[in-house]
């Protein structure tokens, strides 16, 4: 069954957590559907952006940060894993360092820490995409 | 109640028809959410678009034409009646030379013809809005 | 080993123009941010410019910015600092330092020796 | 954008702790860095990431940070140790900060 678009959820991240994404763009690429994941410092959608994740499906992926309510420097990928009309799993795991960004068990993106991963405290998955799957794994301490 | 998003119908279009939409932006401007409608040569999504209007909220609008496949020259406007957070209702009206398209109740937006409206088969709504009412009249004949 | 040699500096009147440069070797030059910072005598050290690896990308401190333009030439390893408009404020030791990665947090964790400038009339 | 606040003079015994504090940061956002300046010479980093130490760094020198500040400890103090200590903070790119300096002299 479908989540619902934006899904937000609260989440507590650090090295070794990962999130899964499982969902499927919901238009064709010609029309450029897009696929966003954030990781927000509050439970609020108005609250800085740690990772911001943006996927323009068939075009490019940009990954940035939002820092006191000011977007930064904007890191741009022409590599595009995903396949037009076809499901997807994402899963983007904390690495000591970075973001690794997976797309069906390919490594595909990196984006370095700028802000550490604990300021994180919610997700939200949004844009143009029906949403199957989220879930977020802890390390085991 | 809300209407699916994207939402499609198939739609006939000549000089006098409106197509009249009421929505709300899913997420605050900061957040910069979507709003796209597309006037289809055909009934499928891939088909070429008599008219793109496409609302970055908070920033800008673009318009356009996809023909034979290809995007054509864009129109940009930074006008920007739509207000955070709260509903709009957008009316596109064919005019004899242009589309007029009024945001709660102002002019403001026009594109000129570059495809006959009579070619227009299907209109699609989607992007990052809630959809509560979608029409298209007709001039009486 | 890793190197980075300063140039450049020198006494200038106020209004005036430098041209720092910051010759790099020992390491893959254009894979790491470079900055300038700079020390006024007997004082803190201030963040001065950063520029990405590419060069496409500058950043300024609000007490240079529209005066001074950071830039790189990645064939030649070299970092650049154009000051123009020179103010008696400007005097300081100015360093080029290199990010030990684009990682936040990292630092920089290499430093050249420094070079003077002197705004004076 | 944050303002760094250390204090400008710190004194320990040789052989005791000494413990700098930076203050006035987002320390649950940004990792804090911080570098050591001795007389005539450029800085040197001697932590980052809030408690990493790059080699060559005695491990005597241990950084960590909670809420708005962040402490830099040299557990038994060598009269080598006596600098200025800068703590800096920020992300990677343009909103980099630098406290004021601390003079640590080691008696």
């Known amino acids: 069954s479908l989540l619902p678009v934006p899904y937000t959820e609260a989440a507590s991240l650090s090295t070794g957590s990962t999130v899964t994404i499982k969902g499927r763009p919901l238009a064709c690429f010609l029309n450029e559907p897009y696929l966003q994941v954030d990781f927000h410092t509050e439970m609020k959608e108005e609250s800085d952006i740690v990772f911001h994740f943006q996927v323009c499906f068939g075009r490019r992926v940009v990954m940035n940060s939002r820092e006191y309510g000011a977007w930064k420097q904007q890191v741009e990928s022409k590599n595009m894993p995903f396949q037009d009309g076809q499901e997807f799993e994402l899963s983007i795991s904390v690495l000591p360092d970075k973001y690794q960004v997976m797309v069906n068990g390919q490594s595909s993106y990196t984006f370095d820490h700028r802000i550490k991963p604990e300021a994180v405290k919610m997700v939200q998955v949004w844009r143009d995409i029906s949403l199957t799957k989220f879930n977020v794994s802890y390390l085991k301490r | 109640s809300l209407l699916p998003v994207p939402y499609t119908e198939a739609a006939s279009l000549s000089t006098g028809s409106t197509v009249t939409i009421k929505g709300r932006p899913l997420a605050c401007f900061l957040n910069e959410p979507y709003l796209q409608v597309d006037f289809h040569t055909e009934m499928k999504e891939e088909s070429d678009i008599v008219f793109h209007f496409q609302v970055c909220f908070g920033r800008r609008v673009v318009m356009n034409s996809r023909e034979y496949g290809a995007w054509k020259q864009q129109v940009e406007s930074k006008n920007m009646p739509f207000q955070d957070g709260q509903e709009f209702e957008l009316s596109i009206s064919v005019l004899p030379d242009k589309y007029q398209v009024m945001v709660n109740g102002q002019s403001s937006y026009t594109f000129d013809h570059r495809i006959k409206p009579e070619a227009v088969k299907m209109v699609q709504v989607w992007r990052d809005i809630s959809l509560t009412k979608f029409n298209v009249s007709y001039l009486k004949r | 080993q890793l190197q980075l040699v300063e140039s450049g500096g020198g006494l200038v009147q106020p209004g005036g123009s430098l041209r720092l440069s910051c010759a790099a070797s020992?390491?893959?030059?254009?894979?790491?941010?470079m900055y300038w910072v700079r020390q006024a005598p007997g004082k803190g050290l201030e963040w001065v410019s950063a520029?990405?690896?590419?060069?496409?990308?500058?950043y300024y401190a609000d007490s240079v910015k529209g005066r001074f333009t950071i830039s790189r030439d990645n064939a030649k390893n070299t970092l650049y600092l154009q000051m123009n408009s020179l103010k008696p404020e400007d005097t300081a030791l100015y360093y080029c330092?290199?990010?030990?990665?684009?990682?936040?947090?990292?630092?920089?964790?290499?430093w050249g020796q420094g070079t003077q400038v002197t705004v004076s009339s | 954008q944050p303002v760094l606040n250390q204090p400008s003079a710190v004194s320990v015994s040789l052989g005791q702790t000494a413990r700098i504090t930076c203050q006035g940061g987002?320390?649950?956002?940004?990792?804090v860095s911080w570098y050591q300046q001795k007389p005539g010479q450029a800085p040197v980093l001697v932590i980052y990431?809030?408690?990493g130490r790059p080699s060559g760094i005695p491990e005597r020198f241990s950084g960590s940070s909670s809420g708005d500040t962040a402490t830099l400890t040299i557990s038994g103090a060598q009269a080598e140790d006596e600098a200025d200590y800068y703590c800096q903070s920020g992300s990677s790119s343009d909103n980099a900060v630098f406290g004021g300096g601390t003079h640590l002299t080691v008696l």
């Open positions: 520029i990405n690896t590419g060069g496409g990308s500058t």
């Open positions: 020992g390491f893959t030059f254009s894979s790491y941010w």
């Open positions: 990431r809030d408690s």
């Open positions: 330092a290199r990010a030990g990665s684009g990682v936040a947090g990292t630092g920089y964790d290499y």
């Open positions: 987002n320390f649950g956002y940004y990792y």
